[in-house]
Structures are given as structure tokens and as C-alpha cells.
Interface confidence: medium
């Protein structure tokens, strides 16, 4: 079968998922695409415990997650239900602020320096986190 038991090289295992933490920045759509090119997705936060885990690894740095409202309602990239799921917005957020002068509002969610969430302009080049479920993750190091 195609099930896997270990995370890929340089990914971090936590609670049956594998995580990869970028050290460079991309716009949200590019970060989303990059995770997909790892056969993964931008991180989907489903619990306070997962929030703390991610926060510990990213530190006080703006970092994209797999949550956006570019088509209207807020949606997680893996289909996890937003309305009933875990949320950790900063006070007054999300506010779809238009005052930034970059055109449009704010449609993509990121972890802020204190870990809580904010919506921001999707074109900003923030770091990002990829996640893939452990039974889908690669079990062997790359061969050369």
C-alpha cells in the first residue's frame, strides 16, 4: 500500500502529522502551491495543542497558515469546517482592513508574533508551514 510511518527528512512529527517550517517568505498563494508540491498543504490548526506546537516552532514571526476567505467565507485548505473548528484570532480580527493602500482587503490568515491569528494582504511575503498526515508522508530519506 501507499501508507507511510515516518515523516520525510527535515520534517517534524507531531500527533500523526508531519510539519515543515519555511525559513524564507512567499505570498500566500505561492506558499500554498509550494506545500502542494510537497504533496502536503498549508498548516490547518485544529486544536489549542496544535497551535502551541506550531507557535513553538515558528517563534515570533508572521507565518501563513492554510486559512483564507478569498472566495467569501473563511475556509481551511483541507476542507476542515471553519465555523465549528478551533480559532485563535487576535482581538478585533479578522477585520478585512482596506486601509493598507495595497488594493482590496485582507483575505489570508497568518500567525502573528504572539501566535494569535490576523488576516492580512495575501501578497505579503511571509514564512509558511506545510503539513501532511503521517500515513501520507514519506518514510525514506531522499536517494541520490
Amino acid at each position: 500500500g501507499s501508507e507511510r510511518t515516518c515523516c520525510p527528512v527535515n520534517w517534524v512529527e507531531h500527533e500523526r502529522s508531519c510539519y515543515w517550517f519555511s525559513r524564507s517568505g512567499k505570498a500566500w498563494a505561492d506558499a500554498d502551491n509550494y506545500c502542494r508540491l510537497e504533496d502536503a498543504h498549508l498548516v490547518v490548526v485544529t486544536s489549542w495543542e496544535e497551535q502551541k506546537f506550531v507557535q513553538h516552532h515558528i517563534g515570533p514571526v508572521n507565518t501563513w497558515m492554510g486559512l483564507h476567505d478569498q472566495n467569501g467565507p473563511w475556509k481551511w485548505v483541507d476542507g476542515t469546517d471553519y465555523e465549528t473548528g478551533f480559532k485563535n484570532w487576535r482581538p478585533e480580527q479578522p477585520d478585512d482592513w482596506y486601509g493598507h493602500g495595497l488594493g482590496g482587503g485582507e483575505d489570508c490568515a497568518h500567525f502573528t508574533d504572539d501566535g494569535r491569528w490576523n488576516d492580512d494582504v495575501c501578497q505579503r511575503p511571509y514564512r509558511w508551514v506545510c503539513e501532511t498526515e503521517l500515513d501520507k508522508a514519506s518514510q525514506e530519506p531522499p536517494l541520490l
Partner: antibody, heavy 122, light 107 residues
């Protein structure tokens, strides 16, 4: 030993389709993406697309979107590339290549098939 | 899409020469670049990945450098078997574009 073995040369008429195979061995097929690259006579390398056999997720260069179809058969560790509505400009050598990974998201094509020559002529 | 400008398009050098091929990228791709060598009638062969890492079995006379938008492949002392065409390729999102190629001939 990692190997990618492609199907043989094809001669096709304009407007028809071709399906090229790439049989993988020597590694876990579902752990790596398979990419397709073509090279027209005397020209450079052109990326067509990628398939992840584990999930069947695919990515295509815009130029080939809708005309190329990438599939994978996990039971036989074989990837396929089908190209439809063939025209003379599609005459090229078509390669499959395994996408390796190191240091997180730094990728590279570490193993290549031997190539399949496609000639499109009326 | 990311644009790749590889130079020179061709060059002729003598055995023992130091050869440098450059690849300039239209945007910052950090270290997400690979170099390949292709000989006539053969599939490309991976030389360098992640901009600076030599692939297994590649002679140490080959080296890669650069990051961001400017990258270089260097052959410190050219050997007769180094003829062929060299390509750079980025991996900073799709499409995984290749450079136009540099044809290296031995004088």
C-alpha cells in the same frame, strides 16, 4: 538500484493522441513525484508537469494544461503521460524524471528515464 | 512565471581551463536551483542541487554557488568528458523552468 524505464518510440498523426509509460523500480514509488520533461530536436528542456503517485495530485505547465494528462498506477509502479491533439511541434523526446528532495523544499530531478521519441507527422 | 537567463549560450574551452556558467533568475528563489549535464542522445544528469550541493558520483571539479537571483556552475579544470550541454532549473514553485542551456565544446 533506482531505474525509470520508458516505453518505446512512437510515430503519430496530427490530431491523434499518445500515451507514454514510465516504469519505476528500486524505490518506493509512492514516495516521490514523477515529472515529465520534453526536448524538441536541437532545443532545450521543457517541463510538462508532475504527478504524486501517492495522492494522484497533478501539476501542469500552463502550456500543457488540458492537453496533457498524467496518471500513475501504484500496483505496477508505472507513471503515464498522455498527450492529445498532437501537432508537428510535439515532435520531441519525452523524459520522465523522479523528483528528489533534500533540506525541506529543495528539489531536484535525481533519476531520469532513457527518453521516448515521439514523431508527429502526416 | 519565473524567467531564467543562462549564459553563455555556448562556449569552447581547452582541457584544464576553468569554466563558469551563470544562471540569472527574475526573482528571489533562495537556494532552490539545480544544475544538469546532458550529452547528445542521453537523458540529463543531475550535477548540483540546492544551488551548492554536489550530487553523488559527480567529480569534485564541479561546484555550484549563489543564492537568491544569481547562480554559478564552475568546472575548475575542464576534462575531455565534460563536453555537453548544461542546464539550470529552478524549483521555486511551478512551472519548474529550465535555463536555455549552455553548450560546452572542448577545443
Amino acid at each position: 538500484e533506482v531505474q525509470l524505464v520508458q516505453s518505446g518510440a512512437e510515430v503519430k498523426k496530427p490530431g491523434s493522441s499518445v500515451k507514454v509509460s514510465c516504469k519505476a523500480s528500486g524505490y518506493t514509488f509512492t514516495n516521490y513525484g514523477i515529472n515529465w520533461v520534453r526536448q524538441a530536436p536541437g532545443q532545450g528542456l521543457e517541463w510538462i508537469g508532475e504527478i504524486f503517485p501517492r495522492s494522484d495530485n497533478t501539476f501542469y505547465a500552463q502550456k500543457f494544461q488540458g492537453r496533457a494528462t498524467l496518471t500513475a498506477d501504484k500496483s505496477t509502479s508505472t507513471a503515464y503521460m498522455e498527450l492529445s491533439s498532437l501537432r508537428s511541434e510535439d515532435t520531441a523526446v519525452y523524459y520522465c524524471a523522479r523528483k528528489g528532495r533534500d533540506y525541506g523544499t529543495s528539489h531536484y530531478f535525481d533519476y531520469w528515464g532513457q527518453g521516448t521519441t515521439l514523431t508527429v507527422s502526416s | 512565471d519565473i524567467q531564467m537567463t543562462q549564459s553563455p549560450s555556448s562556449l569552447s574551452a581547452s582541457v584544464g581551463d576553468r569554466v563558469t556558467i551563470t544562471c540569472r533568475i527574475s526573482e528571489n528563489i533562495y537556494s532552490n536551483l539545480a544544475w544538469y549535464q546532458q550529452k547528445p542522445g542521453k537523458a540529463p544528469k543531475l550535477l548540483v542541487y540546492a544551488a551548492i550541493n554536489l550530487a553523488d558520483g559527480v567529480p569534485s571539479r564541479f561546484s555550484g554557488s549563489g543564492s537568491g537571483t544569481d547562480f554559478t556552475l564552475t568546472i575548475s579544470s575542464l576534462q575531455p568528458e565534460d563536453f555537453g550541454t548544461y542546464y539550470c532549473q529552478h524549483f521555486w514553485g511551478t512551472p519548474f523552468t529550465f535555463g536555455q542551456g549552455t553548450k560546452l565544446e572542448i577545443k
